[in-house]
Interface confidence: low
């Protein structure tokens, strides 16, 4: 999916005002240096495109985002102000309820939401230019 | 736990130059912008500018453009302000702060105890 | 350059007295933030986005607005209470309001 035509404003009030407590959450327990940010974006839609991957694709180690509530704020708000998007995520969805496993929270899955965190930041601040 | 430990005292000449450092630990020094702020005696806080340990990338109040550079130095997690032309207006306690967007509207949430400059002649 | 005015400039009350600290912004911002500073002290982040009390901030304290008003709240002030108040918007770029000083009459 090209996140080009979202409306990235809107993206950042719904981050901005539950997504980021909701990660937070997730967190709690877990000290913010504890993992080191390897992910990392270039510009609004490549952050999305990255926030996209790592929230709803499951990894080794870490098959269990996607029904966490961050992962479902973060779909409902993609899906409201990116036109489209909800329309390439049917398939995808329906092949994830039917392979729905029991919720843990691993260290590798507090390490992705870790670098979840470090992108949704440089989602909110596009980088200043340098002068 | 978050620590911004600010290099010690300074008393210039006016027309000089100084340079006030900003030791920063406790957490990932690229992820956070770093502000300078100004606090002359008595007087209200007074933002002179912003920066990006990630690239570099700044941005200055107006009033201070010119005058104030704003660097870092990644591999040593430590911000630096250098202002240069300094007159007997310049004396005030500077601080750098860090600005967190874990909250909302990104607020300066750690500050260092400040740099105490002096221009006199 | 967003200009932010604070009133008072002085609030002089009695412990146990309600304060009430406004900030008026020159054109509309999406959140404030509060500082508190003491003499010879960095100032601290006391309340976040508005509302939202930074940690170790008492209950007592409470922030409000939205728009170009802004109104941070003591509703029953304690000596540990008196200090310097001020606000900062980061709508565009980023300024601080002159400061209100809450003193003991």
């Known amino acids: 999916y090209d996140f080009t035509n979202c409306d990235f404003e809107k993206i950042k009030a719904a981050y901005l005002s539950t997504i980021s407590k909701d990660l937070i959450t997730y967190m709690s327990g877990t000290k913010s240096t504890e993992f080191n940010n390897t992910v990392s974006c270039s510009n609004r839609p490549h952050c999305l495109t990255e926030i996209q991957s790592l929230t709803f694709n499951p990894t080794a180690g870490c098959a269990s985002l996607a029904k966490e509530m961050f992962a479902m704020k973060t779909k409902a708000a993609l899906a409201i102000w990116c036109p489209g998007y909800s329309e390439t995520q049917i398939n995808a969805t329906q092949a994830m309820k039917k392979r729905r496993k029991r919720k843990v929270t691993t260290n590798k899955c507090l390490e992705q939401v870790s670098q979840l965190q470090g992108l949704w930041r440089r989602f909110n601040r596009p980088l200043l230019k340098q002068q | 736990e978050v620590q911004l430990v600010q290099s010690g005292a300074e008393v210039k000449k006016p027309g000089a130059s100084v340079k006030v450092s900003c030791k920063a630990s406790?957490?990932?020094?690229?992820?956070?912008?770093m502000n300078w702020v100004k606090q002359a005696p008595g007087q209200r806080l007074e933002w002179i500018g912003i920066?990006?340990?990630?690239?570099?990338?700044?941005s200055y109040n107006q009033k201070f453009k010119g005058r104030a550079t704003l660097t870092v130095d990644k591999s040593a997690s430590t911000a630096y302000m250098e202002l240069s032309s300094l007159r007997s207006e310049d004396t005030a306690v500077y601080y750098c702060?860090?600005?967190?967007?874990?909250?909302?509207?990104?607020?300066?949430?750690?500050w260092g105890q400040g740099t105490t400059v002096t221009v006199s002649s | 350059e967003i200009v932010l005015t604070q009133s008072p400039a002085t609030l002089s009350l009695s412990p146990g007295e309600r304060a009430t600290l406004s900030c008026r912004a020159s054109s509309s911002v999406s959140y404030m933030h509060w500082y508190q500073q003491k003499p010879g002290q960095a100032p601290r982040p006391w309340i976040y986005a508005t509302s939202n009390l930074a940690s170790g901030v008492p209950a007592r304290f409470s922030g409000s607005g939205s728009g170009t008003s802004y109104t941070l709240t003591i509703s029953r002030l304690e000596p540990e209470d008196f200090a310097v108040y001020y606000c900062q918007q980061w709508s565009s770029n980023r300024t601080f309001g002159g400061g209100t000083k809450v003193e003991i009459k």
């Open positions: 702060a860090r600005e967190d967007y874990d909250y909302d509207g990104y607020a300066m949430d750690h």
């Open positions: 406790g957490y990932t020094f690229t992820d956070d912008y």
């Open positions: 920066i990006s340990p990630y690239n570099g990338g700044t």
